[in-house]
Amino acid sequence: TTSAEKNTCQLYIQTDHLFFKYYGTREAVIAQISSHVKAIDTIYQTTDFSGIRNISFMVKRIRINTTADEKDPTNPFRFPNIGVEKFLELNSEQNHDDYCLAYVFTDRDFDDGVLGLAWVGAPSGSSGGICEKSKLYSDGKKKSLNTGIITVQNYGSHVPPKVSHITFAHEVGHNFGSPHDSGTECTPGESKNLGQKENGNYIMYARATSGDKLNNNKFSLCSIRNISQVLEKKRNNCFVESGQPICGNGMVEQGEECDCGYSDQCKDECCFDANQPEGRKCKLKPGKQCSPSQGPCCTAQCAFKSKSEKCRDDSDCAREGICNGFTALCPASDPKPNFTDCNRHTQVCINGQCAGSICEKYGLEECTCASSDGKDDKELCHVCCMKKMDPSTCASTGSVQWSRHFSGRTITLQPGSPCNDFRGYCDVFMRCRLVDADGPLARLKKAIFSPELYENIAE
């Protein structure tokens, strides 16, 4: 086979007990893993990395640490208070030679607005990134640096899925060899030119993202140049040909009837686990209608749930999902009317998603309230609106000029929302905290390559 066909990066995804605690069930956790992987798969597949096309991702194996694993001494992620650098290191201390990349998903509020951390790949002579094998480092420990971590929490709030998906794409972008974007060509969101600015920054922007601007889920030319060099050199080391589904990864893929994982993970009475012989594994057991691995509308007794059963909670922008009685999948929810307030009145619903700014309800655009001299920053965490393409009219929702629309109500951004032109995130005290994007990885490099600087954690 030619190297051109080796285009699939196989992932090992682990989730810690806090991620499980937030999503509540194995099925919900698997759905999260699946949506994150699908999201980055779409981004990378549609990017031409200087002639290298159709880069895709496949989950090879998952490990879900449930709340029952919180006290398990073999679970490295059991500690409640771990900094982001240590959390990545705990992942890296495992041997991940069987995978292209290994990630841990968590629901922890790391310091300084950090949503993820990953080792940066390079074409040669550097440790870290895709296909990197486990080896001994100067701190005396064996480590796999084909790793990264992401969290779904920021300043006490949960980030929207689109932001979390971009965080995952961003961290994987580091593994693939891209540093943060810099320079005017690759940070258009920082431009003084309104036309350029309105499309936002690219995936590898160093600071904050809202996830809803045109460039937010695209790679910049800077990233493409860096990633293509790494792919050229490294992908033959561990990428595989795409095609076959992976029985045992917990996700029902084309060609599988069900997938409840390997025998040590499968708690399903309906599905043959991945350790079964070839003709049986990932197939429904005789006489069973469905498996819970197929979706939330299947009971533990392997039958479709009845027509009236709820399978998805009502959200700000969509009604609850109701099983239809003849499939395990939860049917799509009906959207609530466009311009319904959502995310605590800071945004509005657009086609069933909490996507637009509250400003759009009144034909205005969201903007950043920042004084030109940078002295008055008390409004950086207010929702601010302006007339379309007229930054001179930018003012807080609580301002005199928008009294007709907001009746003097100062609407503040949710903690964890981007602020000050995407330079930082709002904290719980409504202060805009700038992001130190490169600090954590620099500290971790120092720790691993100069062990005397390393502080161990206490259990």
Partner: nanobody
Framework: KVQLVESGGGLVQAGGSLRLSCAAS????????MGWFRQAPGKEREFVAF????????DYADSVKGRFTISRDSAKNTVYLQMNSLKPEDTAVYYC??????????????WGQGTQVTVSS
């Protein structure tokens, strides 16, 4: 400490008139925007009218245009709302507010306790 005190509310028959006053103390508000807002039971607060420091910029909610008039007396540090042709739907608690600056971008940072206006049919 800035204080805004409303007065002049009460019970009035539909078609009648009332004049609300708002006295500001603790700071000279002659240079700042002043406004009136109202909140009916079970509803969100809504904008009624505002006036700039010089009186040169005035705006009204569509629902009160032509019936209500906002004015100010800088010497007395007081803003008024003259309400004519009152309707039952004007029933609400009326709040006086003062902005923190003299531009349209200033925020409404100071609020009174409110005065009840009830219009009976």
């Amino acid at each position: 400490k800035v204080q805004l005190v409303e007065s002049g509310g009460g019970l009035v028959q539909a078609g009648g008139s009332l004049r609300l006053s708002c006295a500001a103390s603790g700071r000279t508000f002659s240079r700042y925007y002043m406004g009136w807002f109202r909140q009916a039971p079970g509803k969100e607060r809504e904008f009624v009218a505002f006036i700039s420091g010089t009186g040169g910029s005035i705006d009204y909610a569509d629902s009160v245009k032509g019936r209500f008039t906002i004015s100010r007396d800088s010497a007395k540090n007081t803003v008024y709302l003259q309400m004519n042709s009152l309707k039952p739907e004007d029933t609400a608690v009326y709040y006086c507010a003062a902005a923190s600056g003299n531009s349209g971008r200033s925020t409404w940072d100071y609020w009174g306790q409110g005065t009840q206006v009830t219009v009976s049919s």
